[in-house]
């Protein structure tokens, strides 16, 4: 049976609205919840597309609004349609389209042909997309003070760029308890908004923000060592796009060190943790003397999944240690703000050459085939992978 409604279903999850002049909004489309495809045509009264219009269309993957009266698409129009991958807005009355409109979408196809698009910095992102062949952009006509059949380049004197963002930081070293003043300087045309992103700072400092474009100020009050390795970000937006810059405030504090008991892993490991800012230099002592690192005994840092902390963990790695490696291991850590040391006794194996007359004398019988090897106490058969 033919459909006489304004919008008719197409397949299990499509909707086609083509009866001329019957829609001025897309709000409240019936059965829109599981819609994946929406096709709108010949709707001269449909002039604006706002984010409320597509609310509830979370599954939408393809949107076509063609040969209609669309003049304005809100920057957040597609906030509720994150899966949108095909967008065709050809043959409407669009003069511009904000970069924010498509931000966050994984568009495979964007068609804007047949619109009186005005060549300005606000469309620089679109020009770049087309030049780079991104996601099948089709524009065909972009007007620069007059109609034309191709995407006209912006004039040579026109400088379209995202804002330039710089953060000024203190030159002096920052210590625990200090107040730190940061300033974000923004330059650029048609600046719209700017702000700080401080999500990583919770608990590391009290924050006070002040000022507005083009200069934003930030005071971090009573900083702690937890502030280290945390990003402080300033962002700014204009017609062309968004820019952001991140810095990390380095808060100095003395070296500290912790040693654990030797554990037998793939090789032997004397585990340690060191902290301090700047990162402390490390030195090992063995029985009070400097221990020079070699391929048999060396420091190996563990690659931490946490890149936002100053503490480093690692091992003094001992490859197949013998009785000569038994003794007292000390780790010295030092930075300009202090030094620390920790020691641990390690016994890897007994001295096989110490003979006690009262010990029983071991007797071993070789197998008949004679294919035997003498085994040293330290050996762990085939435990170390070759090369």
């Amino acid at each position: 049976a033919s459909c006489r409604e304004v919008c008719c279903p197409v397949g299990p999850s499509g909707l086609r609205c083509t009866r001329a002049g019957s829609l001025d909004t897309l709000r409240g489309l019936r059965g829109a919840g599981n819609l994946t495809e929406l096709y709108v045509e010949n709707q001269q009264h449909l002039q604006r597309l706002e984010f409320e219009d597509l609310q509830g269309l979370g599954e939408l993957r393809s949107l076509t609004i063609v040969k209609s009266g669309l003049r304005f698409v809100a920057p957040d129009a597609f906030r509720f349609t994150p899966r949108l991958s095909h967008l065709n807005l050809s043959s409407n009355a669009l003069e511009s389209l904000s970069w924010k409109t498509v931000q966050g979408l994984s568009l495979q196809d964007l068609t804007l042909s047949g619109n009186p698009l005005h060549c300005s910095c606000a469309l620089f992102w679109l020009q770049r997309w087309e030049q780079e062949g991104l996601c099948g952009v089709h524009t065909q006509t972009l007007h620069d003070s007059g109609p034309g059949d191709q995407f006209l380049p912006l004039g040579h004197n026109t400088s379209c760029g995202v804002p330039t963002v710089k953060i000024q930081m203190p030159n002096d070293s920052v210590e625990v308890g200090d107040d730190v003043f940061l300033q974000c300087q923004v330059e650029g045309l048609a600046l719209q908004q700017a702000d700080w992103i401080l999500t990583e700072l919770e608990g590391a400092a009290t924050v006070k923000k002040f000022g507005d474009l083009p200069s934003l100020g930030l005071i971090l009050v009573n900083v702690t060592s937890d502030l280290n390795k945390k990003n402080v970000t300033c962002w700014a937006e204009n017609d062309v796009g968004r820019a952001e810059v991140s810095v990390q405030v380095s808060v100095s504090f003395p070296a500290s060190v912790h040693l654990g008991l030797a554990v037998e892993q793939h090789h032997w490991c004397i585990p340690f943790s060191v902290d301090g800012q700047p990162a402390p230099s490390l030195r090992w002592l063995f029985n009070g003397s400097v221990l020079n690192e070699t391929s048999f005994i060396f420091t190996q840092f563990l690659e931490s999944a946490l890149t936002n902390e100053t503490m480093r963990h690692g091992c003094l790695r001992l490859n197949q240690p013998t009785h000569v490696n038994n003794g007292n291991y000390t780790l010295l850590a030092a930075n300009p703000y202090g030094q620390a040391a920790a020691s641990v006794m390690a016994a890897f194996m007994d001295n096989p050459f110490e003979f006690n007359p009262e010990d029983p004398i071991p007797v071993s019988f070789s197998p008949v085939d004679g294919n035997s090897t003498s085994r040293d106490p330290v050996e762990k058969k085939d435990e170390t992978p070759f090369g």
Epitope: N292, E293, T294, S295, F296, F298, T299, Q300, F301, N319, Q320, T322, H323, V324, P352, F353, T373, S374, R375, D376, V378, E379, T384, P385, F386, G387
Partner: antibody, heavy 117, light 109 residues
Framework: QVQLQQSGAELMKPGASVKISCKTT????????IEWVKQRPGHGLEWLGE????????NYNENFRGKATFTADTSSNTAYVQLSSLTSEDSAVYFC??????????WGAGTTVTVSS | QAVVTQESALTTSPGETVTLTCRSS?????????ANWVQEKPDHLFTGLIG???NRPPGVPARFSGSLIGDKAALTITGAQTEDEAIYFC?????????FGGGTKLTVL
Amino acid sequence: QVQLQQSGAELMKPGASVKISCKTTGYRFSSYWIEWVKQRPGHGLEWLGEILPGRGIINYNENFRGKATFTADTSSNTAYVQLSSLTSEDSAVYFCARTDPPYFGVWGAGTTVTVSS
Amino acid sequence: QAVVTQESALTTSPGETVTLTCRSSTGAVTISNYANWVQEKPDHLFTGLIGGTNNRPPGVPARFSGSLIGDKAALTITGAQTEDEAIYFCVLWYSNHWVFGGGTKLTVL
């Protein structure tokens, strides 16, 4: 699998310097020591020294300190030895080997250096 | 610097057991010297056979074994095969450096 690929043969003038490369694949370059070994006919094998790429720790055989310089580029997983002030005594085949003590590791195929005027 | 001494040449027959030894000029070879045995075949093809006195890496045939015999390190090939004809180097660790022996040329006739 672990592989060490060395650069090609070099013909050098006395007094010049040469840099030999050892490109590694199949393991985490920064975590294992690279050994350098010299082989000369009639002189057997001589250990030049070792480097731990991830931390830049270097141990030289005292006999080659000043003659050999070890470096490593962790971005390309490549170890290098530079031999300076070359003389005929430096004509030899030079090997790199990845060591995993107590094993003396996987070896490269060697780079022949000939010093001749 | 220590000197490591090996037999210059040995000859054996297929199926026989042969033992190569390695002496240190500083005294008895101990487990702290981590004796290694490396095989060299033509065209500079080196393969590690034994590490840490008596550890055999994966892939090395079981006929190769390492041990300490008296004050020397030893490599024993039980049931030698023709493809075992090669030069065998002993390598010893002295606290912070390796020293190679002069190598033993093994002929399997």
